[in-house]
Interface confidence: low
């Protein structure tokens, strides 16, 4: 259940590295429960750490991805998990730490290839219990405390949509994430063909507003399905 996943003991007992730092902005990975690590505005221990529930990667920090914390666990229970370092297993780009991307099921350096043009590759192999250490996490940055007290306006930098003011969501623009307007009726939206494909977007759009869904424009006829325009429409 959700409660058991959010229980601190459940988090502590997750297999490393998934239990290391499950989704606090700017957090460094801790090797064992009780070790201090930077999380948000103050230092916290794993013992009192509360993970961040999520539905998709965009709701997590730049150094995080959204997934079920346990192998073969309840797919409906997802939290923000620490990104995967170089040479670690992955299933999509968002799982890999900044400067890396997912290729053939492994996080590799984006310096090695033109990774933005790559097509995501799906792997069927499940995660092993590969133990991550603290190395490679030195690039994690903490946001100023101001971020947590004032909601970001349009164009403000953010880690997740909850950092943004009402009517805005947190979406990628190049490799930064900023607050953008939630889409209104009639506005062009992005329809993802398969789960996880949003990880390839350099310029993410927000989702459609309440009562709207992203659908093919009825009067928009193109030669191929791939070029059809999607807009936010009433349910």
């Amino acid at each position: 259940t959700l409660n058991s996943v959010l229980n601190s003991n459940a988090i502590k007992n997750l297999p490393p590295p998934l239990g290391g730092a499950a989704g606090h902005p700017g957090s460094a990975v801790s090797a064992a429960p009780g070790i201090l690590y930077p999380g948000g505005n103050k230092y916290q221990t794993i013992d009192n750490y509360q993970p961040y529930p999520c539905a998709e990667d965009e709701e997590c920090g730049t150094d995080e991805y959204c997934a079920s914390p346990t192998r073969g666990g309840d797919a409906g229970v997802q939290i923000c998990l620490a990104c995967r370092k170089r040479r670690k297993r992955c299933m999509r780009h968002a799982m890999c730490c900044p400067g890396n991307y997912c290729k053939n099921g492994i996080c590799v350096s984006s310096d090695q290839n033109h990774f933005r043009g790559e097509i995501e590759e799906t792997i069927t192999e499940s995660f092993g219990n590969d133990h991550s250490t603290l190395d490679g996490y030195s690039r994690r940055t903490t946001l100023s405390s101001k971020m947590y007290h004032t909601k970001g306006q349009e164009g403000s930098v953010c880690l997740r949509s909850s950092d943004c003011a009402s009517g805005l969501c947190c979406a990628r623009h190049f490799w930064s994430k900023i607050c953008k307007p939630v889409l209104k009726e009639g506005q062009v939206c992005t329809k993802h063909r398969r789960k996880g494909s949003h990880g390839l977007e350099i310029f993410q759009r927000c989702y459609c507003g309440e009562g709207l869904s992203c659908r093919i424009q009825k009067d928009h006829h193109q030669a191929s399905n791939s070029s059809r325009l999607h807009t936010c429409q009433r349910h």
């Epitope: 900044p98 400067g99 984006s110 310096d111 033109h114 933005r116 043009g117 690039r139 940055t141 946001l143 100023s144 349009e154 164009g155 403000s156 930098v157 623009h173 190049f174 490799w175 930064s176 900023i178 607050c179 953008k180 506005q187 062009v188 390839l200 350099i202 310029f203 759009r205 791939s226 070029s227 325009l229």
Partner: antibody
Framework: QVQLVESGGGVVQPGRSLRLSCAAS????????MHWVRQAPGKGLEWVAI????????YYADPVKGRFTISRDNSKNTLYLQMNSLRAEDTAVYYC?????????WGQGTLVTVSS | SYVLTQPPSVSVAPGQTARITCGGN??????VHWYQQKPGQAPVLVVY???DRPSEIPERFSGSNSGNTATLTISRVEAGDEADYYC???????????FGGGTRLTVL
């Protein structure tokens, strides 16, 4: 108030080097990818380079690849462009910019003239 | 490398609607951003992510993007809209930012 101020431009001979700086203020510089864009006199905009918010990756336009180096010092809120082996065709106004959607800011530019 | 094609010039009478196009191979799959640049000034973003508009830009400016063409539409054109307009995309295959050649909008 967001400000980007370029400096370091001037007249330089072909084959020589120049280093441009861009001082940023009014926003959290370390959280944004930064770009250099140039514009030759009477011509259109030409992208030069991008550096990720944390400096981890850099990409360059083909005409400057191997000659120009983009870098940043987040502790000083400053973006740099080291230009080596300058050519006459590098003559342009050089802008630093965030190019970040609604948070899109440009400096006023600094003129680089490569002439013998 | 990816190429964006704009008409060199577009002319329109005050109060009319101006449409500036930006052509590129399957540009509809990319996010397009539009800039306005007046002489001696730095460019100013007028539309981003195809159709979103910065809060300080008038509603007269709008954008669309589909197939092989993106379009910047300026309704009820004013004399102050006279400027050069550039489209811009990120080309993921080369990891480059690409600008169109620019379009000079003349208000008759």
């Amino acid at each position: 108030q967001v400000q980007l101020v370029e400096s370091g431009g001037g007249v330089v001979q072909p084959g020589r080097s120049l280093r441009l700086s861009c001082a940023a203020s009014g926003f959290t510089f370390s959280r944004y990818d930064m770009h250099w864009v140039r514009q030759a006199p009477g011509k259109g905009l030409e992208w030069v380079a991008i550096i990720f918010y944390d400096g981890s990756n850099k990409y360059y336009a083909d005409p400057v690849k191997g000659r120009f180096t983009i870098s940043r010092d987040n502790s000083k809120n400053t973006l740099y462009l080291q230009m080596n082996s300058l050519r006459a065709e590098d003559t342009a106004v050089y802008y630093c910019a965030t190019l970040a959607a609604a948070f899109d800011y440009w400096g006023q530019g600094t003129l680089v003239t490569v002439s013998s | 490398s990816y190429v964006l094609t704009q008409p060199p010039s577009v002319s329109v009478a005050p109060g009319q609607t101006a449409r500036i196009t930006c052509g590129g191979n399957n540009i509809g799959s990319k996010s397009v951003h539009w800039y306005q640049q007046k002489p001696g000034q730095a460019p100013v973003l007028v539309v981003y992510d195809d159709s979103d508009r910065p809060s300080e830009i008038p509603e007269r400016f709008s954008g669309s993007n589909s197939g092989n063409t993106a379009t910047l539409t300026i309704s009820r054109v004013e004399a102050g809209d006279e400027a050069d307009y550039y489209c811009q995309v990120w080309d993921s295959s080369s990891d480059h930012v690409v600008f169109g050649g620019g379009t000079r909008l003349t208000v008759l």
